[in-house]
């Protein structure tokens, strides 16, 4: 039977969402509760480390939300963005693999605002490379496991 | 030759889209016309049943649209949402695997409004489990086969 | 060792983005620089040609953006759309496999506007068929390789 291919589906750790409106790397993800799982990949410091060379499909789903019960937004014009970043440890460097998002005007008479971003793509990854997620406005993240997550699964070897 | 892996790509049955603005389960999908297809999975009562344990990539694309020729919207503040739901028959329970969407203000001087949601993720599914799609505001769904669909394909066995 | 499965990840050629606001086919993509890559598929005239029958997962990520420094928008009501199109050469015909997007009001006091679309789905493709990308408002496309791309990878054979 062939060796199980690497995969991960990581869900946001609600207890460790940073505050702020600047772009931040999300550094705390679950890997073993609810829908979260990992196999033949490693999670360290919020980065998903590749242990096996290959072509992988990477994806991320990021939800932002605000309800007026938590107060008002200090600015009505928001950039709600996600960046899927590849870091090479051997040659310390970071590169955006995928980005998505939208500018939003969350003023108005609505008591609730919501917006989700989904990105996905097929990438060549080498053992030792790491995938991380950066977002703007982390304090607006939806902490549900069905809302804010990212993942990867190996599709094929590098020939 | 290895047994063909399970997959499905299901497109909305335009004739059976429910009306209303509340959250509903979409219960009628095509599986054998146009782009719709299914293999080693079963469609029953709008739910996609898993017949083979495995890790699957699940996805959904949901489009909402409104043209002023069809009349005015009852409310200008809309929550346009999709939920991908897993139901276990053995232990009757439902859980959201993925969600996406946006709040929208579809007032204004534009005669046409459109919005699409895409979600995707990698999940462990057991034989007998079912996947279904819930949406808000089903009366605004775009009934085209390229617009509103969901699907799954098996990536690997559970070891 | 099994033959490497076909795949492609194609990123927008910034130098060849057409102008205008009408729906156009994007005809220039990179296949061999940065994240762009192709194997056992062919790129010709901006169309991704299938060389091997199979079931493929197709995806596209399209980002639109506008900064006031580049001038004013001629219209504040925009339809920002993507269509993933399959063309059969044997029987000359085109069909939309997937679509996504949103209507947007990019007026207001914000100096920067951004919006991304992601679509993905599982399709049966035959050798000789071609996949292309159509967008509205191509002059608003974000030319970054992490922003505007599409791709495909073969998941399994047609039995």
């Amino acid at each position: 039977k062939p060796e199980a291919q690497p995969f991960a589906h990581l869900t946001i750790n609600a207890a460790s969402i940073p505050s702020g409106s600047h772009k931040v790397t999300l550094s705390s993800w679950y890997h073993d509760r609810g829908w979260a799982k990992i196999s033949n990949m490693t999670l360290s410091n919020g980065k998903l480390r590749v242990n096996q060379d290959g072509f992988y499909y990477l994806y991320a789903n990021i939800c932002f939300r605000h309800h007026e019960t938590s107060g008002d937004l200090a600015t009505e014009y928001l950039q709600l963005m996600v960046y899927v970043v590849k870091t090479s440890i051997k040659i310390p460097s970071s590169h955006n693999l995928m980005k998505g998002g939208s500018t939003k005007n969350w003023s108005g008479n609505s008591e609730f605002h919501f917006y989700s971003i989904n990105v996905g793509g097929f990438f060549k990854l080498r053992a030792g490379e790491e995938i991380s997620i950066q977002v703007s406005n982390p304090s607006l993240l939806d902490p549900d496991q069905d809302a804010t997550y990212f993942g990867a699964f190996k599709v094929q070897d590098i020939d | 030759k290895p047994e063909a892996q399970p997959f499905a790509h299901l497109t909305i049955n335009a004739a059976s889209i429910p009306s209303g603005s509340h959250k509903v389960t979409l219960s009628s999908w095509y599986h054998d016309r146009g782009w719709a297809k299914i293999s080693n999975m079963t469609l029953s009562n709008g739910k996609l049943r898993v017949n083979q344990d495995g890790f699957y990539y699940l996805y959904a694309n949901i489009c909402f649209r409104h043209h002023e020729t069809s009349g005015d919207l009852a409310t200008e503040y809309l929550q346009l949402m999709v939920y991908v739901v897993k139901t276990s028959i053995k232990i009757p329970s439902s859980h959201n695997l993925m969600k996406g969407g946006s709040t929208k203000n579809w007032s204004g001087n534009s005669e046409f409004h459109f919005y699409s949601i895409n979600v995707g993720g990698f999940f462990k599914l057991r034989a007998g489990e079912e996947i279904s799609i819930q949406v808000s505001n089903p009366s605004l769904l775009d009934p085209d086969q390229d617009a509103t669909y969901f699907g799954a394909f098996k990536v690997q066995d559970i070891d | 060792k099994p033959e490497a499965q076909p795949f492609a990840h194609l990123t927008i050629n910034a130098a060849s983005i057409p102008s205008g606001s009408h729906k156009v086919t994007l005809s220039s993509w990179y296949h061999d620089r940065g994240w762009a890559k192709i194997s056992n598929m062919t790129l010709s005239n901006g169309k991704l040609r299938v060389n091997q029958d199979g079931f493929y997962y197709l995806y596209a990520n399209i980002c639109f953006r506008h900064h006031e420094t580049s001038g004013d928008l001629a219209t504040e009501y925009l339809q920002l759309m993507v269509y993933v199109v399959k063309t059969s050469i044997k029987i000359p015909s085109s069909h939309n496999l997937m679509k996504g997007g949103s209507t947007k009001n990019w007026s207001g006091n914000s100096e920067f506007h951004f919006y991304s679309i992601n679509v993905g789905g599982f399709f049966k493709l035959r050798a000789g068929e071609e996949i292309s990308i159509q967008v509205s408002n191509p002059s608003l496309l974000d030319p970054d390789q992490d922003a505007t791309y599409f791709g495909a990878f073969k998941v399994q054979d047609i039995d």
Epitope: S19, G20, S21, H66, E68, T69, S70, G71, D72, L73, A74, T75, E76, L78, N137, S139, L140 | - | -
Partner: antibody
């Protein structure tokens, strides 16, 4: 330590305007929002509006919309609240209060008023 | 618009007594509720934020509890300096106040 010091008591005739100042010290003024809250004799506290001292964004209670202006001078670390078309029922003690949310760390104005000014009595009488 | 209702509107208790003030919201507000102390001629003081978090510098005899639509402020052992009017607050809405006096 954090302090908000308001301008002194004012007496106005109906129809006139009043402008109350609130000088902040002991923290980075631009990183917080300032709220204005009033209390009329025998009444509950009443929220009037806020200003994000960093970007100047404002939000007001519907009740005061069109009559209130809130501004700030970041160089002077001072917020101002002007109320126009005064009537007798505007007689109240007017407070400025700092929102506890640091705008560097977040973008939610949380309505936790962690520091208050001493209050300014505005009397409207003919 | 959310309405906050406090009870009682006033109370009289002895030094050392345990005092409880209730605040109800007209709809669920999760834990977004604050308590303030107001003494005549002085600046109001934040006691409790987020329903149960004690503001820095506030004596530990003050505590808050509750979530959803029902909340309480408790003074475990009333002191003479606690004579004041207490207000609950959720974002833009304040309760009508509870006046606490010493018997």
């Amino acid at each position: 330590q954090v302090q908000l010091v308001q301008s002194g008591a004012e007496v106005r005739k109906p129809g006139a305007s009043v402008k109350v100042s609130c000088k902040a010290s002991g923290y980075d003024f631009s990183n917080y929002a300032i709220h204005w809250v009033r209390q009329a004799p025998g009444q509950r506290l009443e929220w009037m509006g806020w200003i994000n001292a960093g970007n100047g964004n404002t939000k007001f209670s519907q009740k005061f919309q069109g009559r209130i202006t809130v501004t700030r001078d970041t160089a002077a670390s001072t917020a101002y609240m002007e109320l126009r078309s005064l009537r007798s029922e505007d007689t109240a003690v007017y407070y400025c209060a700092r929102d506890s949310s640091n705008m560097v760390r977040g973008i939610i104005i949380a309505y936790y008023f962690d520091y208050w000014g001493q209050g300014t009595l505005v009397t409207v009488s003919s | 618009e959310i309405v906050m209702t406090q009870s009682p509107s006033s109370l009289s208790a002895s030094v050392g007594d345990r005092v409880t003030i209730t605040c109800r919201a007209s709809q669920s507000i999760s834990r977004y509720l604050n308590w303030y102390q107001l003494k005549p001629g002085k600046a109001p003081r934040l006691l409790i934020y987020g329903a149960s978090s004690l503001q820095s510098g506030v004596p530990s005899r003050f505590s808050g509890s509750g979530s959803g639509a029902e909340f309480t402020l408790t003074i475990s052992s009333l002191q003479p300096e606690d004579i004041a009017t207490y207000y609950c607050q959720h974002t833009r809405a304040f309760g009508q106040g509870t006046k606490v006096e010493i018997k």
